[in-house]
Structures are given as C-alpha cells and as structure tokens.
C-alpha cells in the first residue's frame, strides 16, 4: 500500500517517499522506484537554507552601498548574506534593508535621548498627561495644555498623541 506520510527530510510524490535535498542544494529530479532524488549544489551567489524540494536557489541579498549598506557576513550556499550599515548609521529594520542616520520617534512617543555617533535615538512612550503628535528625532513628549490656568475647561481629553481641547466654562445665568 502506498504511503500517506513520509519520514522527516522526505516528501511524498507519486505515491512514494523521496529524500529532500539538503541545504545548499536544489532539486533536479524526483526519485523514482529505481532512482534516488537528484540534487545539485546552488550556484555562486545563491543559497537554500533548509531541507527542500525547490527547483531554484534563492539569490543572496545585495548590500547596496547607495543605501549605506555593506556586507556584515558573506553568504554561503546554505546561508543568505547579512547586511549592516556603514559606521554611524542604523538599520531601519531587523532585515537591514536600508539605513538611517538615526531613527525618529513616532507619534505617541518622545525622544528620551538624542542619537550620538555611537547610539541611536532612544524613544519613550508619552506618559499620562503628555503627548507627541509628530515623528521627531529631537522632540520630547509635551505636557497637555492646562485648561484651568486659562480659566477654561477640558472639552476633549488628551491622549498620548493629542493635546486636550479646552473650551469655555458653562456659566449659569
């Protein structure tokens, strides 16, 4: 009876279990009743990082110097290239696809520490009573407007991203 499931590092095809190709190799042809799976090493600047049945290897990532990127770790047939940023610059994401001089803090966050040559911007959430409605690399959270000191009342509560809205007091006639 043909198998319905295969062992680890195997795959099911044409009612039979074939070996997957090892990392660094791609599939050329599936196994048959008489032949093993045929695999071929990935070419220069290509990789596959898992046991697989891929017919094409993936291209190594290109660390584009025009985006401030350089190679941190050269790729192999089993691993992708790892990019990093030029000295003094910071990756915009874990994948490091582009670089910024320093990150900015989003609305709802204020700058706790301005970036230096060695450290990126440090952001902090605006606590209750403070807000930031801009993306900035230098602005701290600002305190909500005090309506009382203007002889006004709060018409709309503030948030971490918006100031309070003040309005006139309702006066009894």
């Amino acid at each position: 009876e043909p198998p319905t499931a295969c062992r680890e590092k195997q795959y099911l095809i044409n009612s039979q279990c074939c070996s997957l190709c090892q990392p660094g190799q791609k599939l050329v042809s599936d196994c048959t009743e008489f032949t093993e799976t045929e695999c071929l090493p990935c070419g220069e600047s290509e990789f596959l990082d898992t046991w697989n049945r891929e017919t094409h290897c993936h291209q190594h990532k290109y660390c584009d110097p025009n985006l401030g990127l350089r190679v941190q770790q050269k790729g192999t047939s089993e691993t992708d290239t790892i990019c990093t940023c030029e000295e003094g610059w910071h990756c915009t994401s874990e994948a490091c696809e582009s670089c910024v001089l320093h990150r900015s803090c989003s609305p709802g966050f204020g700058v706790k520490q301005i970036a230096t040559g060695v450290s990126d911007t440090i952001c902090e959430p605006c606590p209750v009573g403070f807000f930031s409605n801009v993306s900035s690399a230098f602005e701290k959270c600002h305190p909500w407007t005090s309506c009382e000191t203007k002889d006004l009342v709060v018409q709309q509560a503030g948030t971490n991203k918006t100031d309070v809205v003040c309005g006139p007091q309702d006066r009894l006639r």
Epitope: G68, T92, S98, S136
Partner: nanobody, 116 residues
C-alpha cells in the same frame, strides 16, 4: 526625487561668522523636521541642530549652543544655519538632512574651514 543643496561654506577666521543655506526640492518641505549634521576630517557624523516643521522648536548640540542659530523659510523651501563665533573645531563638511534621514537623502554638503 529628494534634493538637498547646501551652500554658504568657505574659509573664515576664528571668531568670524557664516550663514549656511540648504535649498530643498522633491518633497513637501514644510511637513518635515530638518537637521544640520557635520563631519570633521577623519571623524564621524555629528548632529549639530534641528528644527521642527513649523520652525517653532529647535535643538542644538552642546558644542554649538549659543553660537549657532537654525531657522527655516517654508515659503522658500530653505533651511538656514547662522554660525557665529566660529572656532577651529567647527571645521567640517556641513550637511542638511530630512526625516527619516535615509542614506540616499543627503546633499553633497558645504565645507566650512575655520583657520587664521
């Protein structure tokens, strides 16, 4: 395409003044926080000064506080840096940059040399 064109650099004696300009195009200038950043020969980038989009709030590095003034004219899409009481240690290439400070969004810079 974002373009930032710095000008106004030159050779000046210690104690002298210069006014740098940065002409911006390719983006809505009035919506962006802007920075002046400098790089002295053989040194890393130093953040000098920043200004919010409306021009109402500013930041200055301790090394330039009281001597430099950042300003902007949103009607002319231009950023300025007025530099007074210049010192030898202010010698650097000065760049203007916009949020989010990506590597490709920089001008060529303008060289300021402070020397007697």
């Amino acid at each position: 395409e974002v373009q930032l064109l710095e000008s106004g650099g030159g050779l000046v004696q210690p104690g002298g003044s210069l006014r740098l300009s940065c002409a911006a195009s390719g983006f809505t200038f009035r919506d962006y926080e802007m920075w002046w950043v400098r790089q002295a020969p053989g040194k890393g980038l130093e953040r000098v000064s920043a200004i919010n989009p409306q021009g109402t709030r500013t930041y200055y590095a301790d090394s330039v506080k009281g001597r430099f003034t950042i300003s902007r004219d949103n009607s002319k899409n231009t950023l300025y840096l007025q530099m007074n009481s210049l010192r030898a240690e202010d010698t650097a290439v000065y760049y203007c940059a916009k949020l989010p400070f990506t590597f490709e969004d920089w001008g060529q810079g303008t060289l300021v040399t402070v020397s007697s």
